[in-house]
């Protein structure tokens, strides 16, 4: 009998938004207020997430899906499903244990969130710095000086007048 029952589990008929109520002879009961089940065949409903404090509700909880939170102005989400809210900083800064601090020389942050990242090393790509970096902006890389020799440009082909092995001064 148990084997037959497991093959025809009455709980498998309970749709999302309900749970299989053992206290009521495995009848499908609606999820109580402030709870949900996002899949069928559940034996319990999960408690809805509550967006409190610095969290605010982006999507209300329903009987079939959890609430979704985001952060109040001046804060931003971290992690999956906005697990945490973290204080914004200004561009050119990052949040440290002691609050918002300016990016160190050689690093930048162009957003109000995240960390200061190193400026791009143009020379790794055989390029040179076209525009210097700041705390708020990455460097802009451009052709290396060798590529900008007289008679050469990014549009016209290089003039054929140069001797092999001769580098511009």
């Amino acid at each position: 009998f148990e084997r037959t029952r497991s093959l025809q589990d009455p709980c498998s008929n309970c749709p999302a938004g309900t749970f299989c109520d053992n206290n009521r002879n495995q009848i499908c009961s609606p999820c109580p207020p402030n709870s949900f089940s996002s899949a069928g065949g559940q034996r319990t409903c999960d408690i809805c997430r509550q967006c409190k404090g610095v969290f605010r509700t982006r999507k209300e909880c329903s009987s079939t899906s959890n609430a979704e939170c985001d952060c109040t102005p001046g804060f931003h989400c971290l992690g999956a499903g906005c697990s945490m809210c973290e204080q914004d900083c200004k561009q050119g800064q990052e949040l440290t244990k002691k609050g918002c601090k300016d990016c160190c020389f050689g690093t930048f942050n162009d957003q109000k969130r995240g960390i200061c990242r190193p400026w791009t090393n143009c020379s790794l790509d055989g390029k040179s710095v076209l525009v210097n970096g700041t705390k708020e902006r990455d460097v802009v890389c451009g052709p290396s000086p060798a590529d900008l020799s007289p008679g050469a440009s990014s549009v016209t082909p290089p003039a054929p007048a140069r001797e092999p092995g001769h580098s511009p001064q």
Partner: nanobody
Framework: QVQLVESGGGLVQAGGSLRLSCAAS??????MFWYRQPQGKQREYVAH???????NYADSVTGRFTISRGNNDNTMYLQMDNLKPQDTAVYYC???????????WGQGTQVTVSS
């Protein structure tokens, strides 16, 4: 490409300890997280650590779990002490990129605490 690899899970008796590790590669990460998912339940936040050492814990693990980051910045640990049967779950390492706009995930490591 980004890779997060967890290790250190296993079977332990209640009151015991485990140390989980997460090795991340392929990007700069601003924040690294531990999440866990007990069987048949929702995934839940455990703890996180930022690149400059700020930490935070879920109430259920505060005082028992300690999160830390290795010297190379892309390794993270979770020291779990005084483990309880309700800590049984698959533990996932996750990491936000430098701009906190994308979260990457590891494959998970099973932690089972027997009573």
């Amino acid at each position: 490409q980004v890779q997060l690899v967890e290790s250190g899970g296993g079977l332990v008796q209640a009151g015991g300890s485990l140390r989980l590790s997460c090795a991340a590669s392929g990007d700069i990460f601003s924040i690294m997280f531990w999440y866990r998912q007990p069987q048949g339940k929702q995934r839940e936040y455990v703890a996180h650590i930022t690149s400059n050492g700020r930490t935070n814990y879920a109430d259920s693990v505060t005082g028992r779990f300690t999160i830390s980051r290795g010297n190379n910045d892309n390794t993270m640990y979770l020291q779990m002490d005084n483990l309880k049967p309700q800590d049984t779950a698959v533990y996932y390492c996750a990491a936000d990129d430098a701009t906190n706009t994308r979260t990457y995930w590891g494959q998970g490591t099973q932690v089972t605490v027997s009573s």
